[in-house]
Every structure is written in C-alpha cells, then in structure tokens.
C-alpha cells in the first residue's frame, strides 16, 4: 500500500508568493511559493495519486503583515481552502497567547490540530478540551493512518503559552499515544511535529511504532540529487534513521516559508512496515501557475493589509536616528529602540530566580535602513518601520559562550570607519572600544546585564559562561562576516518578525523617546 505525504513547515505567514530569499515578491516572474501556487501543485498530485495526505508541521503563525493584521484567521481560512489533513502546533502558534490560538485557529480549522506533549491544566483544561488532540486517526483510501503531534518543549521560552499549559518531554509524551494507536490496530503511524531536526531524529530512533517523522522548527532543507535553488541540503531526503529496534525510519522536513512542498512516497506492507521511501521537496517556482480562485481570494484579503500599513501605531517625540552616518559609527537611538523592543518581546518570567531568561541584544547597524522624522506629528506607521527594517527578517534567540560574544564585538570594529554594516548596536550590554589598538584587540570593556538577579546590574562578561542573546536571524546565520556566531552558537530558535516586534513595542509604549545613553563608548 502506497502513501504520498505532502508536507510544509515554518510557513510563517507567507501567504503571498515571495522572492527567492522568501522576502517580499518584487519581480513576479521570478517569485516562488504562496498558497495559490501551493494549491495548484497539491491538487495536481491529488488528482494523479490515490492516497495523499497534506500535513503541516507547525509555525504557520508569525512572519509578515498578514499575521499582524489577521492574527491567525488567515491561517485557518487558507489552510481550510487547501484542505490540509492535519497540523501540529508550533511554538509560534502561541505568540498571541492561548486565546490567540483558540479563537482564530483551533475553533476555525476544519482539520485536526495536534500535540501530544502539551497538557492543559486549571481552568484552561475544559476550555481547550477537544480543540487540539494528541493524535488523530485519518482515513486514507481504504486504510487508516495515525498521526501523533508534538511541539518544542522550549515553547514557554520562545512564545506566550501562559501558565496553564505544560510542555512535556516529546519522547516521553509520544510513546503512550503511539501505544494507544497500536491497541486500536492502527499500524501506519506518522509523528508530525515542531521540535527541530535533532529531536525529529531522536523520535525516529526512540519512539517504538513510529514509521515516519515529519518535522519543523529548524528550517532544515533535505534533498537527494542536485538542489534546485540556493538552499544547501543538510542531508538526503528522506533522512533515514535506524531506530533502537532496528527499523529504518524516514525523517523529513521541507525548509520553510512555503518555498517548497515536501513530497514523500512511502510503501507499506500489509503489517504496516515501511518497505521503501523516496521523494524530494518540490520547489514552488514560477513554472507552477498560481491557482486563480485562491489568488483572487488572496487579493480580496490583501485590501485590509494596505489600509493597515498607513495607520498610526504610536508616536515619537524625538528624531529616530537610523542614518548610516550614526548607526554604523556609534550608538544610535534607533538601534537602542529596536534592541529595547527585542528584549521587551522576549520577557518570559518562567523562573523565580531570574527576572528574565534573556537580557542582551545585538543588532548590526547595517540592518537599520532609515531614520524616522518626528516632525510628521510624531506619527509612526507600519510603512515607516518597513523602511527601517525592509528585509523581512526575524529577531531570534541564541545561546552563545562569552568568548563568542567577545569575538563578535571585536568583529564589530575590526575595520571601523568605513561605514560598514557590522558595527553592532546593543541592549543590555555596555561596551568600550579603544580604536588605537590593533583589530582583534579593541574591546577594552564588555559588561552585560545580569539575569539571575532581582536588581539588574552590569557585570563583566565571563568567557566560559553561556549567555542568551536576542539578535537578527541575519547575524545568527553568519551575516556581515559574523561567522563566529554561526559556527559557535550552542542553540538557535527562530523568533518573531522584526517589524512586528518593533511595532508591538511602539503600540504598547504609545509615546517613545529613545536616547543615546552610553551603551557604546570609545576610550
């Protein structure tokens, strides 16, 4: 019996087609992805093949103005239109709290939404009962297939799930649910979830009875043969893991942003054992036409976005200096504003010993692309912020050793004075540079804000200590020459859309007046 698994993950609000780098589509003839194009390909496969499942491994939420405006209603609407068969909850599905998951998505999805390792307690337990499930048995042709869901147990540090959801260890939570499916004589089981490729492989290895793992969170690109675009494969598709009980378990993921449709064909014997598996992600490029009816629906929903981008979010009573002449040479108040917003967006009081789990922010000055003048009645709009942060990036959470941070700050000024983008703006950090010293030895003082303290204060950076830092995904990926961050980071979790973080902060504060306050000094 043959099953075709079509899968997406980490779509992050890319409902419209995008450029090759998943930013805003500029030249339509070279654009990719989007739900209208995805629908064309899915329907083509459904017509050609008998047993097809369309699955999503989480993080539909967060990433463009679509999510900012529609808050998840767009996800339910278009996933319903594409007739997804099941979805696993990702960490970003909790970005607007549990209510922001329940009302727009859980109540409106016409397909099951899954996670076995999230347990509700207190008053939430009855409210959310039945709206998401640990597993689902789906009819496929004349057979049934079991799908078990899972979600990163780091979600309380990455999003806003509140205090009434407990995120358990994935493997511990999955095994009894798989066992239940086995007692129901369901012998073909897919683990669908959002914990990253390393955990996907562990689940394949450790959870008895799982036949296939469809994952997300780490934006992993797997491919067999010559890759069709810029993404470099982390391994073959499918990636085969040998389980502890000796089975070959295919593990797949389909990069991110709806650029590819994962396509995996699995052959099962009559006892539900995987005989063979093969496939590849399908690049959704312009050779695949956009479905006209879905495209028309997208255009209808778009109207509200255009109106939103010119509405006032808040006011500034000071000039927001985002000029290259400032942000690439010294502390600039636009950099301070953005870093303060980044920290504010990551306030998670999950431990009594810590006032917060993260206190530090770094931001490449080259990523700040425009100032905002206060003389327009102080008004700040989404459109203004899109000029400051035009690249459609995210502000991510990483863990780094102090020694890596020291290297990063040396890199920040290794060729100071040439208006290059690597000069770092900061939050929760006091740095002093001596430019008379040779490159690689210019940081004379680096103090960081404590987290395990009731009164935050600045202490000298410790080289061997592990620190959490919020930074742009561009830096986490080694951009602007920050190779040491990419090479030495100990953990990397994708965060919220950059503009969304700053706009939320400005809306919350209502009136802002960021200052230049001595975060960066020269001796």
């Amino acid at each position: 019996w043959e099953l075709t698994i079509l899968h997406t993950n980490d779509v992050h609000s890319r409902l419209e087609q995008t450029s090759e780098d998943s930013s805003k589509c500029v030249n339509a003839s070279r654009c990719m992805g989007g739900v209208a194009r995805l629908f064309t390909k899915v329907q083509q496969i459904r017509r050609a093949e008998p047993n097809v499942l369309l699955l999503d491994a989480g993080d539909q939420y967060q990433g463009t103005i679509w999510f900012t405006v529609y808050k998840g209603a767009e996800v339910a609407h278009f996933m319903n239109a594409l007739r997804y068969d099941a979805m696993a909850l990702g960490n970003h599905e909790f970005d607007n709290g549990v209510e922001g998951l329940i009302e727009p998505l859980l109540k409106e999805a016409k397909f099951p939404i899954l996670s076995a390792n999230i347990k509700a307690k207190g008053p939430l337990a009855s409210q959310i009962s039945g709206l998401y499930l640990p597993y689902k048995v789906l009819p496929v042709g004349d057979e049934v297939v079991g799908i078990v869901g899972y979600t990163s147990k780091e979600t309380p540090f990455l999003s806003n799930p509140g205090t009434n959801l407990v995120f358990e260890d994935e493997i511990t939570a999955l095994q009894p649910e798989v066992d239940k499916l086995k007692t129901l004589n369901v012998n073909k089981i897919i683990a669908l979830g959002h914990s990253g490729f390393e955990m996907d492989k562990l689940i394949a290895q450790k959870v008895r009875g799982v036949d296939v793992v469809v994952g997300g969170h780490s934006n992993t690109f797997l491919y067999t043969g010559n890759p069709p675009s810029k993404e470099v494969p982390a391994g073959k598709y499918p990636f085969i893991v040998t389980s502890d009980d000796g089975r070959k378990v295919p593990v797949v993921q389909a990069y991110a942003f709806g650029k590819y449709l994962g396509y995996l064909k699995i052959e099962f014997d009559e006892r539900g054992n995987v005989i063979s598996s093969h496939g590849n992600p399908i690049l959704l490029n312009s050779s695949i036409p956009e479905d006209p009816s879905i495209k028309a629906d997208i255009n209808k929903w778009r109207i509200k976005l255009d109106n939103y981008s010119t509405q006032e979010l808040g006011k500034t009573i000071v000039y927001l200096d985002g000029s290259s002449q400032s942000c690439r040479f010294r502390e600039c108040n636009m950099g301070n504003l953005i870093c303060d917003a980044m920290i504010n967006n990551n306030l998670r009081h999950t431990d009594e010993m810590f006032w917060n789990h993260v206190s530090m922010c770094i931001l490449n000055g080259g990523g700040i692309r425009s100032p905002i003048d206060e003389r327009n009645n102080g008004t700040i709009t989404w459109e203004n912020l899109a000029a400051v942060l035009p690249f459609g990036g995210t502000f991510d959470l990483v863990q780094l050793k102090g020694s890596t941070l020291k290297k990063a700050f040396e890199h920040s000024v290794h060729r100071y004075g040439q208006s290059t983008g690597e000069f770092l703006q900061v939050g929760g950090i006091h740095v002093v540079y001596d430019l008379s010293r040779k490159p690689g030895d210019r940081v004379v003082k680096l103090d960081v804000l404590c987290t395990k303290c009731r009164v935050p204060s600045y202490d000298p950076l410790k080289m061997d200590e592990v620190y959490k830092v919020i930074l742009p995904n561009f830096l986490a990926n080694g951009g602007d020459g920050f190779q040491m961050i990419k090479d030495e980071l100990l953990r990397h979790d994708s965060g919220d859309q950059d503009i969304n973080v700053v706009s939320t902060y400005i809306s919350k504060m209502k009136v802002i007046y960021p200052a230049v306050e001595g975060r960066i000094k020269f001796s």
């Epitope: 397909f111 689902k136 789906l138 004589n185």
Partner: nanobody, 124 residues
Framework: ALQLVESGGGLVQPGGSLRLSCEVS????????IGWFRQAPGKEREGVSS????????YYADSVKGRFTISRDNAKNTVYLQMNSLKPEDTGVYYC?????????????????WGQGTEVTVSS
C-alpha cells in the same frame, strides 16, 4: 465541551421506519464529519452511514444501502438517520459520532466524539 445527544430510537415492527436525530452542541456542525454506528448485543460496533462536513458526500454500509438515508441540518446543528424497511438484524444501540476532517468514514477509529446512544429494536 463537545456533546452529541441521540434520540428517536424505539420499538418498531419489521418493515417499519424510524428517524434518529443527533443533536450536536459545543461546536459548529459544518466543521465535522458525522457518522452513525450501531452495536448489536454481543457484536462489534459497526459503521452504518457517514456524512462529510460539507454534506456533499455520504457513505453507507452495504447492509443498509437503499434503506437508510443520512442528512444534516447545519442550521439546527442536527444530523438525521432515516431508517426505512427495517429488519430484525437492524436491532442495536445506535450511536452518532463526529470528527474534524475532509473525508467521511465508516471506521470507528477515526471518530473523536461519541454520543451515549439510542436503542432501536426491530421485532414483531
């Protein structure tokens, strides 16, 4: 919470008719596939009929084809099973069940929510 309540069961003579109702509360009916199942004394639960969320497609077990009709009134959040030409072998407890998804099914494993059942006896 999601609830399904069946009604309309009773004693009927062979060749007679009954109309079972399944009233759904706690969710919108048009998001759910609904199935009718029955369990005769000492036998396995078996699928009788199912209706897709849109109401556009219906399935019937071979044993009831041409005699039973499933229908839904989404406005009233109610699903019906019209049973004609009843036979003694149609006797049992009839359950309605629901699940979110696109494809109706007669496989009980697919259904997530169940009613308490209503008893149907076909006897002279």
């Amino acid at each position: 919470a999601l609830q399904l309540v069946e009604s309309g069961g009773g004693l009927v003579q062979p060749g007679g008719s009954l109309r079972l109702s399944c009233e759904v509360s706690g969710f919108t009916l048009d998001y759910y596939n609904i199935g009718w199942f029955r369990q005769a004394p000492g036998k396995e639960r078996e699928g009788v009929s199912s209706s897709s969320a849109s109401g556009g497609s219906t399935y019937y077990a071979d044993s009831v084809k041409g005699r039973f009709t499933i229908s839904r009134d989404n406005a009233k959040n109610t699903v019906y099973l019209q049973m004609n030409s009843l036979k003694p072998e149609d006797t049992g407890v009839y359950y309605c069940a629901a699940y979110r998804g696109w494809h109706p099914s007669l496989d009980a494993r697919v259904y997530d929510y169940w009613g308490q059942g209503t008893e149907v006896t076909v006897s002279s």
